[in-house]
């Protein structure tokens, strides 16, 4: 707590300007009116105050707005935002995308801090859903943002927002997240023609079920191995050799290099060796000829 001392004669701040730069801690406390500070927050950003001085300015705003800052102040916090705690931010009601952008700009280039995470959470909850403009903004600043959300949080993403998602935004998503995003993407891109559809849906395919992969295999899509390796194992296993060959097109040769890795390894174990041999890639580990394959899961379901 800063001691309450009288402002020295002639030092009372009439506006927030560079004359304050060398004010001591107690002088700032005594000579800068909190209401003046609130109305001229945008000027603070142009003055490279020390961190001690910023602490005093924050303290003044905290006293003026104990229930949380109004958005008119929040939008102009600039680098004073870096002084805010998640507890401070939880008191805010941020509704404007411009305010969100202004504060994310301050944190640009940094990893997502607890302050930023809290700000985004408050903003998205206030909007009720993760709309396209918000998603556009967030992924522009934090490409990994989408994959930091839980499947439950992702369920609030409307299909229309999927248009804002870039392939790199999904790099760190796990299968559970892609399971939620894939149906939304399928819905969002449903009116596109074959090749355009595949380009858009490709990065979401880690959430695709078997029947959709079968359908894609009929469309000459030439899926690359990197995409194939990200598919759900349980979705790949039921595919026939012919379907995988059609799905991968010229990329089918890449299976040899991946034969020890999932999902290729598990898929090979489910295929007849005869069928694998038709690929001419030397893939080994299929079911020997003459062996009967019993699907025990099917048998259990029938009984």
């Amino acid at each position: 707590e800063v001691e309450k001392t009288a402002c020295p004669s002639g030092k009372k701040a009439r506006e927030i300007d560079e004359s304050l730069i060398f004010y001591k801690k107690w002088e700032l406390e005594a000579c800068v009116d909190a209401a003046l500070l609130a109305t001229q927050m945008d000027r603070v950003n142009a003055i490279p105050f020390t961190y001690e001085q910023l602490d005093v300015l924050k303290h003044k705003l905290d006293e003026l707005y104990p229930q949380g800052y109004p958005e008119s102040v929040i939008q102009h916090l600039g680098y004073l935002f870096l002084k805010m705690s998640p507890e401070d931010i939880r008191k805010w009601n941020v509704t404007s995308l411009e305010t969100l952008k202004a504060l994310l700009e301050v944190n640009k280039g940094h990893e997502m801090s607890p302050q930023v995470a809290t700000l985004i959470d408050r903003f998205v909850k206030g909007r009720g859903q993760l709309d396209k403009d918000t998603l556009d903004t967030l992924t522009a600043f934090y490409p990994g943002y989408l994959c930091s959300l839980s499947p439950e949080e992702l369920s609030s993403v409307p299909p229309s927002s999927i248009w804002a998602v870039r392939p790199q935004d999904l790099d760190t998503c796990d299968p559970r997240q892609l399971d939620v995003l894939y149906p939304k993407a399928r819905l969002a891109f449903q009116n596109m023609n074959g090749s355009e559809y595949f380009v858009k849906i490709q990065s979401f395919l880690g959430g695709a079920p078997t029947e959709d992969l079968k359908a894609l295999s009929q469309q000459n899509v030439s899926m690359d191995l990197a995409t194939f390796m990200k598919l759900r194992t349980d979705a790949v296993l039921p595919l026939t050799v012919a379907e995988v060959q059609k799905l991968l097109g010229p990329h089918v040769e890449g299976l040899k290099a991946e034969e020890r890795h999932r999902p290729v390894r598990d898929w090979i174990l489910r295929q007849r060796q005869d069928d694998l041999d038709t690929l001419g890639l030397g893939l080994q580990g299929g079911i020997p000829n003459g062996y009967l394959v019993l699907d025990l899961s099917m048998q259990e379901a029938l009984s």
């Epitope: 004359s19 730069i21 961190y51 600039g78 700009e105």
Partner: antibody, heavy 120, light 107 residues
Framework: QVQLVQSGGGLVKPGGSLRLSCAAS????????MSWIRQAPGKGLEWVSY????????YYADSVKGRFTISRDNAKNSLYLQMNSLRAEDTAVYYC?????????????WGQGTLVTVSS | EIVMTQSPATLSLSPGERATLSCRAS??????LAWYQQKPGQAPRLLIY???NRATGIPARFSGSGSGTDFTLTISSLEPEDFAVYYC?????????FGGGTKVEIK
Amino acid sequence: QVQLVQSGGGLVKPGGSLRLSCAASGFTFSDYYMSWIRQAPGKGLEWVSYISSSGSTIYYADSVKGRFTISRDNAKNSLYLQMNSLRAEDTAVYYCARDGYRTHNWFDPWGQGTLVTVSS
Amino acid sequence: EIVMTQSPATLSLSPGERATLSCRASQSIGNSLAWYQQKPGQAPRLLIYDVSNRATGIPARFSGSGSGTDFTLTISSLEPEDFAVYYCQHRYSWPLTFGGGTKVEIK
């Protein structure tokens, strides 16, 4: 790109004067506070002087107060350090540096440095 | 004024080794700390600011940590170009001061 190019160093006798210049390019010079920082041979860094974006607010280290004058000409994108009554202990490489603005306030970038040698 | 003390004065290491540099402030400075790198005959350049944020173009092998009075700069695996002098600086209050520097030299 953002650049600070210095000139004006040299050899001067004790009690003499010297003027250092720092020409800025690649950024809006008039938005930024600027500093002079010096480094005596084989020693660390010492913050010498500071000037606000408009030039109206100035700071000097106690070691140079009353002898050095910092100034700027925003129309010419230039920063200056007028050094009078020079002493042997002022011998150093002098750097101009831009202060941060709006996002983070640290010295970045720095000029290439100019050597000032005070010796009889 | 706040006095910044760096240790060790010299660190002798081989390329590939991990370097740990220390900086201590004479009073608490929160997260108001930056690190600069200076190579012989060159100006210092900003490396890390606000304790842990890498400046533009600085490789990920450089990282900063600490708060209050004790701070650390870590170079996870030294590259030949990392052998230089490193300075810490605070921006907590006026005047701004630098540490005396730590020289990282090849063993």
